[in-house]
Interface confidence: medium
């Protein structure tokens, strides 16, 4: 977990339930401090693109990864669970090279049965030199990237190529687009759901369809649960990010599987290669697209965006700028919602949701995408929440 | 190469049902719809509706909802189609077809050999 | 349902000439920068065969002599020269939305 976003100093951590800060050390040290004893339950992480397990050490007071020695699948599905995802949707554990690790959480297999995290100790040493690799959901998996692809500027989709992409409709009309992260979870973007949207009886999605038409009654998946992120700002479009809870699970298959959320620990690089899909118009002003599009965007660092003759210091730590600053390719009305995504150790990565811009495709005027890098948090959270 | 195989010729009795299969080989049967496809002698096509054997979802054309009911079997990339209470108006060639789907294009590639069925008493 | 009216019913062609064939549908089946309609050509006792897809796309395999044009509503088939082997039945399918239909079919005799 990063500690970001918090409204305690950098020496505290800040309870969900009530706003107050503790302090670091009486994080998941086996004693309840927040009301809703949050700081118990949030010790669990996954970091970088290896999906390396790192556990919170409250002596220590920083992250570690777990040592493989006498670790088993059993442990594995808990460590998931504390992160918010189900039992049911835990796909594999592996084993990673320490790469250098100095210091590690090691299980004592002697503590009883005990809840996982009083049977980790801190140690220096690992014998089996491997620490543990978790994937609590088969994520990030296509059957092929699209052609060198109309959102504006982009090509139709191949089936399979942007599984996770959901059109989510109101009355029967492509609204906005959406990233499937479980078979109940969709992140799209808050603005999508401002009053009256925010209630879910409005909202159906459609997964593994590519074509609006044949997006038909009784094809969609009805959303249980609207929730959109307690910081957004209308007006600036910060904290741009919501959920959607369905009322039945996806079933998953070759046209239907989640995008991975970013772990800790992975860099964005300025320049780095990602994708767009979605629905929206082809052209500023335009119409919905019939079909699914998906273009290639780079990242353009934020010091860049916010300068006087791009965004002008509008981009905020929870914004994402991608795109092209001489134009020509860029997502467009009804996109957002939609995918910001990129391929690392061959897995996709929801990166950024689509959020504003200032028109489509102009010069100097790149997409802005909330920065899923610092809603991840509050994504489990809410996952957990919901049990 | 890719192929579509179909179950012989039917006769059956009116008011009886009938399972018409069609075997896929030469491509991942998960990837692609299956389509059917009427058509009565000397005359033109009507589609049937497909199912996506990635999901086992289905679409029917209004036309024949309560006439055929579409299933997949996975296991042996084999696609059936249930023809029910069988009249003399359902005697013709029964096509599976197969179309993308998703981006559905919706065009047919590859159909199969066809299946005769006569429906007499 | 969209309806695909197909004309001529029939028509005879010499060997070497051109036969057009024209498929109207009852609404556009054109958008997002696609013509969502196809051509099957059928010989008795055989299943179809896809000539064109997305109006003027040929099919792999399919000979050059094939095309396909049009736009919106109105749709056309072309055969150029025409041989003996394309004598068949052409059917246009339109894929605009649910559910597919085929036009009711031309006959291609040779003179």
């Known amino acids: 977990w990063k500690f970001m976003g918090s409204k305690c100093s950098n020496s505290g951590i800040e309870c969900d339930s009530s706003g107050t800060c503790i302090n670091p050390s009486n994080w998941c040290d086996g004693v309840s401090h927040c009301p809703g004893g949050e700081d118990e339950n949030r010790c669990v992480r996954l970091y970088g693109p290896n999906f390396i397990l790192q556990v919170y050490s409250s002596q220590r007071k920083s992250w570690h990864p777990v040592c493989q020695d006498d670790w088993n699948e059993n442990y594995g599905r808990a460590a998931c669970r504390d992160m918010g995802y189900k039992n049911n949707f835990y796909s594999s554990q592996g084993i990673v090279d320490d790469s250098g690790s100095t210091s590690f959480m090691k299980l004592n297999t002697s503590a009883g049965n005990v809840d996982i995290y009083k049977k980790l100790y801190h140690s220096d040493a690992c014998s089996s030199k491997a620490v543990v690799s978790l994937r609590c959901i088969a994520c990030g998996v296509n059957l092929n990237s699209s052609r060198q692809s109309r959102i504006v500027g982009g090509e139709s989709a191949l089936p399979g190529a942007w599984p996770w992409q959901v059109s989510l409709h109101v009355q029967n009309v492509h609204v906005c687009g959406g990233s499937i992260i479980t078979p109940e979870w969709i992140v799209t973007a808050a603005h999508c759901v401002e009053k009256p949207l925010n209630n879910p009886w409005h909202w159906t999605a459609f997964a593994g369809i590519l074509r609006q038409s044949f997006m038909f009654y009784g094809a969609g998946y009805q959303v249980e649960k609207v929730i959109s992120h307690p910081n957004y700002d209308s007006k600036t479009k910060n904290n741009d990010i919501a959920l959607m809870k369905l009322q039945k699970p996806l079933t998953f298959n070759d046209l239907v599987k989640p995008v991975c959320l970013p772990n800790p620990g992975m860099m964005l690089q300025p320049e780095q290669l990602c994708w767009i899909s979605g629905w929206g118009a082809t052209e500023e002003k335009g119409k919905t697209s019939e079909v699914l599009n998906a273009a290639k965007v780079l990242l353009i660092e934020t010091q860049r965006c916010n300068s006087r003759y791009v965004y002008d210091n509008l981009i905020t730590p929870a914004m994402i700028c991608a795109g092209f600053l001489q134009g020509n390719v860029d997502s467009c009305q009804g996109d957002s919602g939609g995918p910001l995504v990129t391929s690392k150790n061959n897995i996709w990565w929801l990166i950024g949701d689509t959020s504003w811009g200032s028109g489509c495709a102009k010069a100097y005027r790149p997409g802005v995408y909330g920065n899923v890098m610092v809603f991840t948090d509050w994504i489990y959270r809410q996952m957990r929440a919901d049990g | 190469q890719v192929q579509l195989q179909q179950s012989g010729p039917a006769l059956v009795k009116p008011g009886a049902s009938l399972k018409i299969s069609c075997e896929a080989s030469?491509?991942?049967?998960?990837?692609?719809?299956i389509n059917w496809v009427k058509q009565r002698p000397g005359q033109g096509l009507e589609w049937i509706g497909w199912i996506f054997p990635g999901s086992g979802s289905t679409y029917y054309n209004e036309k024949f909802k309560g006439k055929a009911t579409l299933t997949i079997d996975k296991s042996s990339s084999t696609a059936y189609m249930l023809l029910s209470s069988l009249t003399s108006e359902d005697s013709a060639v029964y096509f599976c077809a197969r179309s993308d789907y998703g981006s559905a294009y919706g065009y047919f590639d590859v159909w199969g050999t066809g299946t005769t069925v006569t429906v007499s008493s | 349902d969209i309806v695909l009216t197909q004309s001529p019913a029939s028509l005879a062609v010499s060997l070497g000439q051109r036969a057009t064939i024209s498929c109207r549908a009852s609404k556009s089946v054109s958008t997002s920068g696609y013509s969502y309609m196809h051509w099957y050509q059928q010989k008795p006792g055989q299943p179809p065969k896809l000539l064109i897809y997305?109006?003027?796309n040929l099919e792999s395999g399919v000979p050059a002599r094939f095309s396909g044009s049009g736009s919106g509503t109105d749709f056309t088939l072309n055969i150029h020269p025409v041989e003996e082997e394309d004598a068949a039945t052409y059917y246009c399918?339109?894929?605009?939305?649910?559910?597919?239909?085929f036009g009711a079919g031309t006959k291609l005799e040779l003179k």
């Open positions: 030469g491509y991942t049967f998960t990837y692609y719809s």
């Open positions: 997305l109006a003027s």
């Open positions: 399918q339109h894929s605009r939305d649910l559910p597919l239909t």
